[in-house]
């Protein structure tokens, strides 16, 4: 058993039929010595008396909020949560496996630049009685600070009868140098509690590997005289690290017709303009990627040819 | 992704072309190592990230863009003194800091060159003959060092008397290539920045 936060405790259980469970001793947080009784959740049934209560925790029915009272007055609470271990593996029932980029990916994180700010997302099918708490650090043995906000519900997806909820959190490394060469990864730890079930999820990454720039901005077309060609120009996204001559991007320009079958023309360039042929009903799209470290491409920025 | 080969403009900062070739060469070598040594811990997640230049050079600090010198987190100032002449500085008003930066890069290259050559000598003795260092990568390191043209004592290749442990050598190769790729990215960013300024 260990303390998750004040008055909230996690009991780690090997989960198999007829498992012996875990013996837990609860102590009432009071100077009182006599006349103390214990109850569980909303029930008025007295489970025991005295300053301590010893219980055998085997299943979810044994978890919950234990309260010690004296003469109708509440003295203190202890909330017991269960963390299940099945065949030596901690349960992952609360979050959905993304399976991308590999199996057992529950948290996905991205950064728009090298400032030390990043966002992580996860999915669940659970809609109620659900809380998340996020901690992060750079390295684990001598951790350096990363501050995370509160996790918030960021989207909802409905597939047939199933609803999926996406949560996200934003974190910022406390003292990040954009030019630094990372040698210790960022660690992200998410505590998830659904009713009386506790689970934890972790992700470990270097900012450089989760970089995904915002799409190029200010995408414009300028027709060239007496020609089907146009000059496409764009700018670095506002969120990209500066100076741009140090944190350079490379770009992919794509001309795509309305129909899926039409051939895509693609040009790669380090400049912020290119000359392409604009076909009727086609659209021109541009995306960006770090020029020197090949992490993810940005989403496309697009303009119609007409 | 293979970066397109850049043909430098005649007036271009002379080292930019060499640094682009360096990044391309080390990225290709790392990719080859990861494929060839697929049953060894050779991915970024599996290896320990070591920097052989730590406390010996200060490339990141010495080569910091002017705009980032206001960022306190970037000013982990380590005092290191370097020789301040070099042909990449040709026909440019250069600050002491820029000379320090380029000589720090030179020292990095020299250190990695020694390590890679020592390692290659061991790998050539491996009866499996599984992997060797790409001669092109070693040549590109040499070219960039020549372009930087700093006068510095040559460091003798390390020779070791003990039996080579080929498994350990291959793991060390992965560690070295990952670290060198990260340093090559920094070098490329620096050259691009100096070229623009």
């Amino acid at each position: 058993i260990w303390e998750l936060k004040k008055d909230v405790y996690v009991v780690e259980l090997d989960w198999y039929p007829d498992a012996p469970g875990e013996m837990v001793v609860l102590t009432c947080d009071t100077p009182e010595e006599d006349g103390i009784t214990w109850t569980l959740d909303q029930s008025s049934e007295v489970l025991g008396s005295g300053k301590t209560l010893t219980i055998q925790v085997k299943e979810f029915g044994d978890a919950g909020q234990y309260t010690c009272h004296k003469g109708g007055e509440v003295l203190s609470h202890s909330l017991l949560l269960l963390h299940k271990k099945e065949d030596g593996i901690w349960s992952t029932d609360i979050l959905k496996d993304q399976k991308e980029p590999k199996n057992k990916t529950f948290l996905r994180c991205e950064a728009k630049n090298y400032s030390g700010r990043f966002t992580c997302w996860w999915l669940t099918t659970i809609s109620t009685d659900l809380t998340f708490s996020v901690k992060s650090s750079r390295g684990s043995s001598d951790p350096q600070g990363v501050t995370c906000g509160a996790a918030t519900l960021s989207a909802e997806r409905v597939r047939g009868d199933n609803k999926e909820y996406e949560y996200s959190v934003e974190c910022q490394e406390d003292s990040a140098c954009p030019a630094a060469e990372e040698s210790l990864p960022i660690e992200v730890m998410v505590d998830a509690v659904h009713k009386l079930k506790y689970e934890n999820y972790t992700s470990s990454f270097f900012i450089r590997d989760i970089i995904k720039p915002d799409p190029p901005k200010n995408l414009q077309l300028k027709p060239l005289k007496n020609s089907r060609q146009v000059e496409v120009s764009w700018e670095y996204p506002d969120t990209w690290s500066t100076p741009h001559s140090y944190f350079s991007l490379t770009f992919c320009v794509q001309v795509q017709g309305k129909s899926k079958r039409e051939k895509k023309d693609r040009v790669f360039t380090d400049k912020t303009s290119a000359t392409v042929i604009c076909r009727k009903n086609a659209s021109i799209s541009v995306r960006a990627q770090d020029r020197y470290y090949s992490s993810s491409w940005s989403e496309w920025a697009s303009v119609p040819c007409s | 992704r293979n970066l397109p080969v850049a043909t430098p403009d005649p007036g271009m900062f002379p080292c930019l072309h060499h640094s682009q070739n360096l990044l391309r060469a080390v990225s290709n070598m790392l990719q080859k190592a990861r494929q060839t040594l697929e049953f060894y811990p050779c991915t970024s997640e599996e290896i320990d990230h070591e920097d052989i230049t730590k406390d010996k050079t200060s490339t990141v600090e010495a080569c910091l863009p002017l705009e980032l010198t206001k960022n306190e987190s970037c000013l982990n100032s380590r005092e290191t003194s370097f020789i301040t002449n070099g042909s990449c500085l040709a026909s440019r008003k250069t600050s002491f800091m820029m000379a320090l930066c380029l000589s720090s890069i030179y020292e990095d290259l020299k250190m990695y060159q020694v390590e890679f050559k020592t390692m290659n000598a061991k790998l050539l003795m491996d009866p499996k003959r599984q992997i060797f260092l790409d001669q092109n990568m070693l040549a590109v390191i040499d070219e960039l060092m020549q372009a930087l043209n700093f006068n510095s004592e040559t460091v003798p290749q390390k020779s070791s008397l003990e039996e080579p442990d080929f498994y350990k050598t291959k793991i060390k190769l992965c560690i070295l290539l990952h670290a060198f790729r990260i340093r090559a990215v920094t070098i490329d960013r620096v050259m691009s920045y100096l070229n623009a300024s």
């Epitope: 960021s154 795509q256 309305k258 496309w300 | -």
Partner: nanobody
Amino acid sequence: EVQLVESGGGLVQPGGSLRLSCAASGRDFDRSTMAWYRQAPGKQRELVASIPSDIGTKYADSVKGRFFISRVYAKNTNTVYLQMNSLKPEDTAVYYCYAHIDSDYWGQGTQVTVSS
């Protein structure tokens, strides 16, 4: 024929709410990223919110905490909604629905005016 049909725009007072919807049909949009963009008079078109098929929803900083995107996957149609709360005069714009599979598809746009 690919169609993105937006609805739900209109005139609303500051502090009020609107819910935009966009039905995408004519292609299998299940694995696409869908999004809402907006364009105010004389300004560039800007991303308001995007929702990929898997994970990684994004919001413009100016709408975070006020706007909420959701998506319904049905047999032949994908519908993306934008719930807009605590609307401000600066949210006035034409709102466009967008979908990307292997190329870009745009709706015709729906006008949102926030004014007292």
